[in-house]
Interface confidence: low
């Protein structure tokens, strides 16, 4: 952090004799510059030069060869790199007075005679004297106006609208300024800016409309920045609404939009005081033609448990707005005949959410479900298979004697979704079959026993076990199981 530059002479203010020369030296730890009262056109007799010295500091000298009333004002020495357009200069100051008996007031530019007052704020009427000792009075149409005076700034106070004149007497001679005109304007310390784009997505040929509204301000410039600006594509309009309060509504219209008009649309408002700025932007996208995107939140094979309540949610992005419908096994879903409902809600401008709701899932709800979204430019669909999961149950367990061969087959029919697995167990000691430890799993690797399994349809399975020869009484158990449960039966 650099310390502030220093100025010689080391004074806050200095009175310089008319037509005499004076110089100001600025010392800094980095390169320094001067800001002084006159504009570049008026400053032909101001010379600024750099000076070498042995202190290791940077030295810049401001020299005035012949001081005049116009040289009265604030001289600021600042570091070059600290200057920004936004902020007041940070540096060291000295105020120079050059009293001139013929020029009581420091000459001003025409715009300085326009004093903008925002609401009931205080303002400065900038009549500055060339001599700090000169008494000054402020007058309007009603007479002398009481206001505090500072010869460096002028009169500070709360002024009503109208013309004001500063009056001074120097050595018995009376001087008057030309009138300062005070204007009252509706303005706020912060810009209340609102942007509205009823749509942010368009397709070729449509008209883009964006509005920006500024509230409680009359003193605003609003600039639009948008992709088609370089081609002058936009039409801007301004509407001033005064009731119930002041509101400036700026509208940008871009007709016959193309894909190239996609991008950021920005409105930047700035107050005429040049200090208060506010900006808002919106991203607009223009598509060659309408589109649809379907994004399901589930897979193409879904399962629901029997009697369960389940929702299937599909996100749809589409423009123009789509019509959304559901099919089951390629037929339109008739909701009032089933405990299935569908709905569509708009989430955002081009985002929709459609839900398929199963109230109490039944076996017959299984099938292929399709969501179809369509608009004038596109059609998209998504199909998934729904399985209603049913716990396994044994429908039938029977045996079949092979007659003289002494062989025997046992058939076990079971159902469930997913399709159940069938396992066989045997108990060779009938008296002990009540004890679970007496049961053993029948292995397929036993040579004289064959086990098979067949599915009859989507949910029914048949298991068979064939004994080549049964020499003693045994008990056989069929165990059918799937994800949701198991059931067994014995023979």
């Amino acid at each position: 952090q650099l310390s502030l530059p220093s100025i010689l002479p080391n004074e806050n203010e200095k009175v310089v004799q008319l037509n005499s020369s004076f110089s100001l030296r600025c010392f800094g730890e980095s390169e320094v510059s001067w800001q002084y009262p006159m504009s570049e056109e008026e400053s032909s007799d101001v010379e600024i030069r750099n000076e070498e010295n042995n202190s290791g500091l940077f030295v810049t000298v401001l020299e005035v060869s012949s001081a005049s009333a116009a040289h009265t004002g604030l001289y600021t020495c600042y570091y070059n790199h600290t200057q920004t357009e936004e902020n007041e200069l940070e540096g060291r100051h000295i105020y120079i007075y050059v009293p001139d008996p013929d020029v009581a007031f420091v000459p001003l530019g025409m715009t300085d005679y326009l004093v903008i007052v925002e609401d009931d704020d205080s303002a400065i009427i900038p009549c500055r004297t060339t001599d700090p000792e000169t008494p000054v009075t402020l007058h309007n149409s009603e007479g002398v106006v009481p206001a505090s005076y500072d010869s460096r700034q002028g009169f500070n106070g709360t002024f009503t609208v109208g013309p004001y004149i500063c009056e001074a007497t120097v050595k018995g001679k009376k001087f008057q300024t030309i009138p300062f005109n005070v204007y009252a304007l509706k303005a706020t310390s912060e810009l209340d800016l609102e942007m509205e784009a009823l749509k942010t997505v368009y397709k070729s040929g449509e008209t883009i409309v964006v509005t920006c509204a500024v509230f409680n301000n009359e003193v605003v410039d609003l600039q639009w920045t948008y992709p088609g600006e370089v081609k002058g594509k936009g039409i801007t309009m301004l509407e001033e609404i005064k009731v119930p309060s002041i509101k400036l509504v700026y509208t940008l219209t871009v007709p016959e939009a193309t894909v190239k008009d996609s991008g950021d649309y920005e409105c930047a408002a700035r107050q005429a005081t040049r200090e208060v700025k506010e900006m808002k932007k919106v991203t607009i996208s223009v598509h060659e033609k309408g589109f649809i995107e379907i994004k399901p939140t589930f897979s193409q094979l879904e399962a629901v448990n029997l009697h369960e309540v389940k929702h299937f949610v599909v996100e749809v992005r589409a423009y123009p707005p789509p019509r959304i419908s559901w099919l089951k096994n390629n037929l339109t879903l008739i909701e009032n005949l089933t405990e299935i409902t569908t709905d569509v809600e708009k989430i955002q401008e081009i985002r929709y959410r459609s839900k398929l709701k199963l109230i109490r899932a039944k076996e017959e709800d299984s099938g292929h479900y399709t969501i179809v979204a369509q608009n004038e430019d596109a059609v998209k669909s998504y199909t998934f298979e729904l399985l209603t999961q049913v716990p396994s149950s044994i429908l039938d367990l029977v045996d079949d004697h092979h007659g003289s061969t002494g062989g025997q087959t046992v058939r076990c029919t079971a159902e469930g979704t997913p399709l159940p697995d069938i396992e066989w167990m045997i108990c060779k000691d009938i008296k002990k079959c009540n004890n679970e430890t007496s049961w053993t799993i029948l292995a397929n690797n036993v040579s004289n026993i064959i086990t098979e399994i067949h599915s009859r349809d989507r949910s029914t399975v048949e298991g068979r076990v064939t004994f080549a020869k049964v020499e003693e009484t045994i008990a056989v158990r069929c165990l059918a199981k799937n994800l949701l449960g198991a059931e067994n039966r014995e023979l």
Epitope: E40, L185, E218, A272
Partner: antibody, heavy 121, light 107 residues
């Protein structure tokens, strides 16, 4: 006090490009305002050509948009007009002008002296 | 584009007279109208903005009125220095457009 000064060739051949420069003194073109080109045809009709704002954004008259480009050189405090494929219809006095916006309304408050451009073979 | 029609295209009046120039917009431009004065061989100068507001330094004999599509510029007590062409310009929407001008001469 801000001053604007146009410069450029007084004579341009048809189908060639017209290039003009506006040099601004007394005010930085990046500080504020919109910096415009306006032309006045021999019959005295005025036409707004386009602008470049303090931020560098531009806006053009749609009747010229396929042929026009307004750019700037902030280091020289200048802004430029380039008009391509000129015809005799582009013969005019070209003004650069500053657009002010006090009191919630914009208008051209400072104008350059103008430079006359003749399109002729 | 918004068309701006000025009438009359030329006008001859005596010193001290009051004259009126009208400007008609092809669509509603609210109060977004500016008047400029261009003296012979000179550049256009801002006269009146927002239909009725006098620019700083413009004599009070100049006045503007109107809103919507119809606007007038009135010069009372005509002075020799008022010899000029007067233009209206709309600021309602891009592109900004000017009227054809009214040339004022002194009889």
């Amino acid at each position: 006090d801000v001053q604007l000064q146009e410069s450029g060739p007084g004579l341009v051949k048809p189908s060639q490009s017209l290039s003009l420069t506006c040099t601004v003194t007394g005010y930085s073109i990046t500080s504020d305002y919109a910096w415009n080109w306006i032309r006045q045809f021999p019959g005295n009709k005025l036409e707004w050509v386009g602008y470049i704002s303090y931020s560098g954004s531009t806006s053009y008259n749609p009747s010229l948009k396929s042929r026009i480009s307004i750019t700037r050189d902030t280091s020289k405090n200048q802004f430029f007009l380039q008009l391509n494929s000129v015809t005799t219809e582009d013969t005019a006095t070209y003004y650069c002008a500053r657009r002010d916006y006090r009191y919630g309304y914009w208008y051209f408050d400072v104008w350059g002296a103008g430079t006359t451009v003749t399109v002729s073979s | 584009d918004i068309q701006m029609n000025q009438s009359p295209s030329s006008l001859s009046a005596s010193l001290g007279d009051t004259i009126t120039i009208t400007c008609h917009a092809s669509q509603n431009i609210h109060v977004w109208l500016t008047w400029y004065q261009q003296k012979p061989g000179n550049i256009p100068k801002l006269l009146i903005y927002k239909a009725s507001n006098l620019h700083t330094g413009v004599p009070s004999r100049f006045s503007g009125s109107g809103s919507g599509t119809g606007f007038t510029l009135t010069i009372s007590s005509l002075q020799p220095e008022d010899i000029a062409t007067y233009y209206c310009q709309q600021g309602q929407s891009y592109p900004w457009t000017f009227g054809g001008g009214t040339k004022l001469e002194i009889k």
